[in-house]
Interface confidence: medium
């Protein structure tokens, strides 16, 4: 239904707290360099204006679109050109071009310092002094670093943050209460960020149809007892929600997500038997819970997939007369039978099925041609299964850090032109798949591994798009989203690469490394490892292990020495010489 004032409608639906949070996220995601105070001022102005529209929907400007209202606010910021350069040109455009322009200027890798967590005591003091401002800072800092973060989900993480602080700040040992809990939230939020970015990439590059196919597969796995019409309705609604969030329409997105959660809870009987626990929760927790609800039990009497999609004499007729519906039912039927497959794999199978029908239905004897299609799926299924087995075996053997190093070597060889910080970040993230997925039951490993890897590789592609340097990466990133992971896995050593010359300073370390937290130490060592591979792309695993063991021993010795500086300055050059010899 149409509302006289869109802003009043959203304010009423969402309530003041969520309204303000979402507006803050929106502004922080668009203008990533502005301070919290600058954004907080704008948010207050927008909220005050929304309240005047609630009081009188006919008041001046209340009938304007949200894009117009928000865009006008952003464009009124002083020194916009000085701080944001060509983004200021967006302000010369009219809606909807202006919003499109803002979206195009979102930076996936803004040059902002890492979000440092204050020490426990200081954090609790500022939280107690003003919880609202404290949570505002959290939303601002996360949103500006992750300009596509799923806004309603960020409100959920802020709520989690709030609950943890409320609980831990009342304890004697605040630090040991806060650290593991906040680390847990941070890890989940980072995974949520890359997953959502993947969804937005899918939407931006391949349109709503591609996202809807993803949603049909995912929802069919989770709700195998729901019929195709129900799954289609949920997929359509979910597509709308994600399109809005990816498009910066955060108020509409959060509102529609709440509506979708409400619909699911009111229609549990036709969707899934597993929803009740989620539906008993308050809004943000409910929507989050529904998004990762466990798979319903599969119906026991499902007929073989071949009956409708291979053996039926009407296959070509059904495909020709309603292509998207027929392929949609295939994806639905296959996915509900395979919660053990990744969504990426299911989409590859649907694509293979479509290509087979395209080819076979044009031939003299279609059934004879497409009769073997299910057997032709086998290699497509085996490839990711082998990937999971090989990588989980390696993870179990090496542990997370060692596994990250193995991936770092592999990916530096595949794309040595990529910057070392990007390679290290990617390898560390890809390496976490072990801890995240390899410990799961067998039937959950494949979907966990492949869909997580796909999301991480999407980030690699986004960063590479900014400054393309590797033909290998460009090739894999140019294809369809579901083919990316197999493409990257299939890459081998880049034979066109001219090795980097050996620079002693790259491998020169100082005593300050000793006081770094363990994570930072690892990053330093991994940076050195990537540089070694760039110097000797064809070094054997044994050679690299020798050098890295020597390096670890050197750090251990010098960091324990009474005179660390002298140790580093005398032993360092010896280490560099030994490295060169080992790799010669």
């Amino acid at each position: 239904e149409a509302h006289k004032s869109e802003i009043a409608h959203r304010y009423n639906d969402l309530g003041e707290q969520h309204f303000k949070g979402l507006v803050l996220i929106a502004f922080s995601q668009y203008l990533q360099k502005c301070s919290y105070d600058e954004h907080a001022k704008l948010v207050q102005e927008v909220t005050d204006f929304a309240k005047t529209c609630v009081a009188d929907e006919s008041a001046a400007n209340c009938d304007k679109s949200l894009h117009t209202l928000f865009g006008d606010k952003l464009c009124a910021i002083p020194n916009l050109r000085e701080n944001y350069g060509e983004l200021a040109d967006c302000c010369t455009k009219q809606e909807p071009e202006r919003n499109e322009c803002f979206l195009q200027h979102k930076d996936d890798n803004p040059s902002l310092p890492p979000f440092e967590r204050p020490e426990a005591e200081a954090m609790c003091t500022s939280f107690k002094e003003n919880p609202t401002t404290f949570m505002g800072h959290y939303l601002h800092e996360v949103a500006r670093r992750h300009p596509y973060f799923y806004a309603p989900e960020l409100l959920y993480y802020a709520e989690q943050y709030n609950e943890i602080l409320t609980q831990c700040c009342a304890e004697a040992d605040k630090e040991s209460c806060l650290t593991p809990k906040l680390d847990g939230v941070k890890e989940k939020a980072l995974v949520s960020s890359v997953r959502q970015r993947m969804k937005c990439s899918s939407m931006q590059k391949f349109g709503e149809r591609a996202f809807k196919a993803w949603a049909v597969a995912r929802l069919s796995q989770t709700f195998p007892n729901a019929d195709f019409a129900e799954i289609t309705k949920l997929a359509t609604d979910l597509t709308k929600v994600n399109k809005e969030c990816c498009h910066g329409d955060l108020l509409e997105c959060a509102d529609d997500r709440a509506e979708l959660a409400k619909y699911m809870c009111e229609n549990q009987a036709t969707i899934s038997s597993k929803l009740q626990t989620c539906c008993d929760k308050p809004l943000l927790k409910k929507a989050h819970c529904l998004s990762e609800v466990e798979h319903d039990t599969m119906p026991a009497d499902l007929p073989a997939i071949a009956a409708d999609f291979v053996e039926d004499q009407e296959v070509c007729k059904n495909y020709a007369e309603a292509k998207d519906v027929f392929l949609g039912t295939f994806l639905y039927e296959y996915s509900r039978r395979h919660p053990d497959y990744s969504v990426s794999l299911l989409l590859r199978l649907a694509k293979k099925y479509e290509a087979t029908l395209e080819k076979c239905c044009a031939e003299a004897n279609p059934p004879a041609c497409y009769g073997t299609v299910l057997a032709e799926f086998q290699p497509l299924v085996e490839e990711p299964k082998n990937l999971v087995k090989t990588n989980c075996d390696l993870y179990e053997k090496l542990g997370e850090y060692g596994f990250q190093n193995a991936i770092l070597v592999r990916y530096t060889q595949k794309a040595p032109q990529v910057s070392t910080p990007t390679l290290v970040e990617a390898a560390r993230n890809l390496g976490r798949v072990g801890t995240k997925c390899c410990t799961l039951p067998e039937d959950q490993r494949l979907p966990c591994v492949e869909d997580y890897l796909s999301a991480i590789l999407n980030r690699v592609c986004l960063l590479h798009e900014k400054t393309p340097v590797s033909e290998h990466v460009t090739k894999c990133c140019s294809g369809s989203l579901v083919e990316r992971r197999p493409c990257f896995s299939a890459l081998t050593v880049d034979e066109t690469y001219v090795p980097k010359e050996f620079k002693a300073e790259t491998f020169t370390f100082h005593s300050d490394i000793c006081t770094l937290p363990e994570k930072e130490k690892q990053i330093k060592k991994q940076t050195a490892l990537a540089e070694l591979v760039k110097h000797k792309p064809k070094a054997t695993a044994e050679q690299l292990k020798t050098v890295m063991d020597d390096f670890a021993q050197f750090l251990d010795t010098c960091c324990k020495a009474a005179d660390k500086d002298t140790c580093f300055s005398t032993e360092g050059p010896n280490l560099v010489t030994r490295c060169k010899d080992a790799l010669a």
Partner: nanobody, 116 residues
Framework: EVQLLESGGGLVQPGGSLRLSCAAS????????MGWVRQAPGKGLEWVST????????YYADSVKGRFTISRDNSKDTLYLQMNSLRAEDTAVYYC?????????WGQGTLVTVSS
């Protein structure tokens, strides 16, 4: 280079008939399924009909079933669409396309206007 050239469109009264032709070149015609797609003014593309490579199998959208007939002459590399009992809602640009349903090449289109 693949080329598809439609002809036969024009203005016709409701209940009337038209025959569209499509001359194909630049690919092996008798190895490929062919089809017709249309776009009414201000609307999206709508699939109309498909014929298999050898002409043995034909498929139609519900909206045209029983009124339209697709055929081909592989010796002339030509595709046809016979349209009978035309209605106002059949007014559209008709495109000849190569493929079964996932068409990879299209012609420029021919306009069919059904009006009294």
């Amino acid at each position: 280079e693949v080329q598809l050239l439609e002809s036969g469109g024009g203005l016709v009264q409701p209940g009337g008939s038209l025959r569209l032709s499509c001359a194909a070149s630049g690919f092996t015609f008798d190895n490929n399924a062919m089809g017709w797609v249309r776009q009414a003014p201000g609307k999206g593309l709508e699939w109309v009909s498909t014929i298999s490579a050898n002409g043995n199998a034909t498929y139609y959208a519900d909206s045209v079933k029983g009124r339209f007939t697709i055929s081909r002459d592989n010796s002339k590399d030509t595709l046809y669409l016979q349209m009978n009992s035309l209605r106002a809602e059949d007014t559209a640009v008709y495109y000849c396309a190569k493929g079964f349903r996932r068409f990879d090449y299209w012609g420029q289109g021919t306009l069919v206007t059904v009006s009294s």
